[in-house]
């Protein structure tokens, strides 16, 4: 059909922190390259419909959807989304195309559906569908990497069963601890799933995708190391492939590797050997022991011994699900202002867990650090000295965990006051928790030394604001005080703090703030 | 059969050193570690620390650090502790002892005797 | 550093009766899945000789008699029956943290 005009549907993803999405604006700025949606005309429909590829947005994800017509002279338009009208402002670009565009801020689920895009223009009236979907993050997925040995090689594939797919790499490192760290310049990436290097010092695996990163370490046994008196641990679930490697370095070739399970040697297919040269002639062996799946009776001591090097032991542990182990009472810290203090945490878990540091409602990113007993520990230290509660929480595939922590801040009393017809109140924070005194001044005591001790009523840690606890105290109003000045004052270990009332007929109040 | 032979008695004077030995035999001397362990009568027995003869890696108790030293001989299959600066503290027998990582101290020397006296 | 107390410090046990030793950490010698006590026999004029390692394994040669029990800072070591044979110190010992440490011992005496 000659009078159809051309027509491009585009959709322009933007980055979550993009300055340029704004309500206001009724075509952003492009943050990222657009998309195109195909736009075909739907055939067998009555009218003139062009449908747009389907849309699938993440949760909070900001975009724009957009119609650029090359048509001549003016359009206008309409936006239809779930049987209400929606404002169109058309524009021209530099091309002198028609563009109509649709932002969804922050997409939620009940933004996503049908948008159908009503336009009329001097030689035609045609209709645009998008139909917009949120992302099933929850049928997505990021598991551990696992460890296969490759068939006739000597060879190790990674294996993450992840969706969507993710990407696979090798970490590779050949020096000992901190070096280690992942951007040290000692660590080399491969990113393939097979590796046949299998002599390096440290080898880890790490799948991700748009859930994350995970990662799986090469257990290791070193014989070239002293052993530790204290035995290392593997945990891992029934069903899970084990892999243990053993390496050792030695003058020259004449020494052999076995492995062990509780004084038994392991059974042929549950081991493989390679060997090398290293560049300056000395004979590295490595004896693999691996489980291809994991059974209770395969818990127990595992020994790597070698012919000239000191025997290593690991004990593997095979659990039937998951576990976070931690004491759950809660805990509480009194600090001053400017005393360093961290909020930790020490516990065992398997799989490793993922955590967060959460006050006040914002969540925190949480590090932890293994200590070489088998446990971990993470710690907080950016509570920036306020009060109130802290919550840790963790999670693996199989366990959570909760843990709760109260701060409070040593420091001497702020008081607020206000007052009404009938009473004066006074507010303070300040740990720990204030007493009250309330004076009156009068001639007879300019110095407001005279204690009123009628009508007060006082009230402790009524109400907590972000868990930081507030005391206050009230004083009911009789004929005896009105029209004086009363000086009500907070007092801890730490200090004293006071607020002159003036209390006289209704009106306004004044405070003076006395400390 | 795996034994451990330790040197002889020692008598000695305070402040000077002595250095004893201790022949492994009825196994491979780098495979395991070797520890050497004090213990006077009436107060038990004292950990003095380990040398690894493969690497010779040691590792001491605080408490004896500058008192003794650990060496080895991977030749003569012999582990060796020198003690310095002796006193009456000294004086006790000093047993060496095989560790086995999966199982503690599985074989001991019968021990030196070391006698500190003027 | 971990201290370890012995009780009794001597005990008399008829022959054929049952031998009970106990050893208390002053603070878990457990790490990761083991605890990392472990028991010594040692007889006049003899060097020791380990009988228990990682609290409950029988060293090969030691008769069945000998048996380790306990975690993280309670241990005993059992002699179920006592033989003339078994009268000895009997010392416990923890390699969880350095420096390692013996607890001072037990006599045990057959009656």
């Known amino acids: 059909n000659q009078d159809l005009p051309v027509i491009k549907c585009v959709l322009i993803n933007h980055k979550n922190n993009d300055s340029s999405v704004g309500k206001s604006s009724s075509y952003p700025m492009v943050s990222e390259s657009p998309e195109d949606l195909g736009c075909a005309l739907r055939p067998q429909s009555s009218g003139t419909v062009y449908e747009a590829a389907a849309v699938e947005v993440d949760v909070s994800a900001s975009i724009t959807l957009q119609v650029l017509v090359d048509a001549p002279g003016n359009i206008s338009c309409l936006w239809v989304f779930k049987h209400s009208s929606l404002n169109c402002q058309p524009h021209f670009d530099l091309q002198n195309r028609g563009v109509v565009s649709m932002v969804i801020l922050k997409m939620t689920e009940t933004q996503a559906g049908e948008y159908l895009l009503f336009i009329q223009s001097e030689a035609t009236n045609y209709t645009i569908l998008f139909t917009v979907s949120i992302r099933n993050t929850l049928l997505y997925t990021l598991r551990r990497p696992y460890f296969r040995k490759m068939e006739n090689q000597d060879a190790l594939v990674c294996i993450s069963e992840s969706v969507p797919e993710p990407i696979v790499e090798w970490v590779l490192c050949d020096s000992q601890g901190e070096s280690c760290k992942e951007e040290s310049p000692a660590v080399v990436k491969k990113e393939e799933k097979v590796l046949h290097e299998l002599f390096g010092t440290d080898i880890r695996c790490c799948a991700r995708n748009e859930l994350g990163r995970e990662c799986t370490r090469l257990f290791t046994i070193d014989l070239n190391q002293t052993p530790q008196t204290t035995l290392p641990q593997l945990f891992l679930k029934v069903g899970e492939p084990l892999w243990i490697r053993c390496k050792a370095v030695h003058v020259n070739h004449g020494f052999g590797l076995t492995w062990e399970l509780e004084n038994k040697a392991l059974e042929e297919g549950n081991y493989f050997e390679m060997s090398t040269y290293s560049t300056n002639r000395t004979m590295i062996r490595i004896l693999f022991a691996f489980v291809s799946s994991v059974a209770r009776n395969d818990t127990g001591y595992y020994t790597c011994s070698s012919s000239k090097h000191p025997s290593q032991s690991a004990l593997v542990t095979i659990v039937e699900k998951g576990f976070i182990n931690a004491t759950n009472s809660s805990e509480d810290y009194e600090i001053d202002q400017y005393e360093e203090f961290c909020f930790s945490v020490r516990f065992k878990a398997y799989p490793q867990i993922r955590c967060t540091w959460t006050f006040s409602r914002k969540s925190f990113p949480c590090e932890q650090k293994g200590l070489d007993n088998g446990y971990s520990i993470s710690k907080f230290c950016n509570h920036k000295h306020q009060p109130g509660e802290y919550i840790f929480h963790a999670e693996n595939d199989d366990a959570q965990f909760t843990k709760m922590f109260t701060l409070n801040i040593r420091r001497k009393p702020q008081v607020l006051a206000e007052a009404s017809a009938s009473q004066a109140s006074c507010f303070s924070d300040g740990y720990p928790l204030p007493s009250w005194t309330w004076k009156k001044c009068s001639d007879k005591s300019p110095n407001c030394t005279e204690e009123i001790t009628e009508g007060v009523w006082n009230r402790k840690a009524n109400r907590k604001v972000f868990g930081q606890w507030v005391s206050s105290s009230t004083l009911n109003m009789s004929e005896a005080i009105k029209g004086f000045l009363v000086k009500c004052c907070a007092y801890n270990s730490l200090g004293t703090s006071c607020e002159t009332i003036l209390l006289n007929s209704p009106g306004p109040f004044p405070f003076i703030q006395d400390n | 059969e795996v034994q451990l032979q330790e040197s002889g008695p020692e008598l000695v004077k305070p402040g000077a050193s002595v250095k004893m030995s201790c022949k492994a035999s009825g196994y491979t001397f780098t495979r395991y570690v070797m520890h050497w362990v004090k213990q006077r009568p009436g107060q038990g027995l004292e950990w003095i620390g380990f040398i690894n003869p493969y690497n010779d890696d040691t590792k001491y108790n605080e408490k004896f650090k500058g008192k003794a030293t650990l060496t080895s001989d991977k030749s003569s299959s012999t582990a060796y502790m020198e003690l310095s600066s002796l006193t009456s503290e000294d004086s006790a027998v000093y047993h060496c002892?095989?560790?086995?990582?999966?199982?503690?101290?599985?074989?001991w020397g019968q021990g030196t005797t070391l006698t500190v006296s003027s | 550093n971990i201290v370890l107390t012995q009780s009794p410090a001597s005990l008399a046990v008829s022959l054929g009766q049952r031998a009970t030793i106990s050893c208390r950490a002053s603070?878990?010698?457990?790490?990761?899945?083991?605890?990392?006590v472990h028991w010594y026999q040692q007889k006049p004029g003899q060097p020791p000789k380990l009988l228990i390692y990682?609290?409950?394994n029988l060293e090969s040669g030691v008769p069945a008699r000998f048996s380790g029990s306990g975690s993280r800072s309670d241990f005993t070591l059992t002699i179920d029956p006592v033989e003339a044979d078994d009268a000895a110190t009997y010392y416990c010992?923890?390699?969880?943290?350095?420096?390692?440490?013996f607890g001072g011992g037990t006599k045990l005496e057959i009656k």
């Open positions: 010992q923890q390699n969880n943290e350095e420096p390692w440490t």
């Open positions: 002892a095989r560790w086995r990582q999966l199982g503690s101290l599985d074989s």
């Open positions: 603070e878990s010698v457990d790490t990761y899945g083991s605890s990392f």
């Open positions: 990682l609290a409950s």
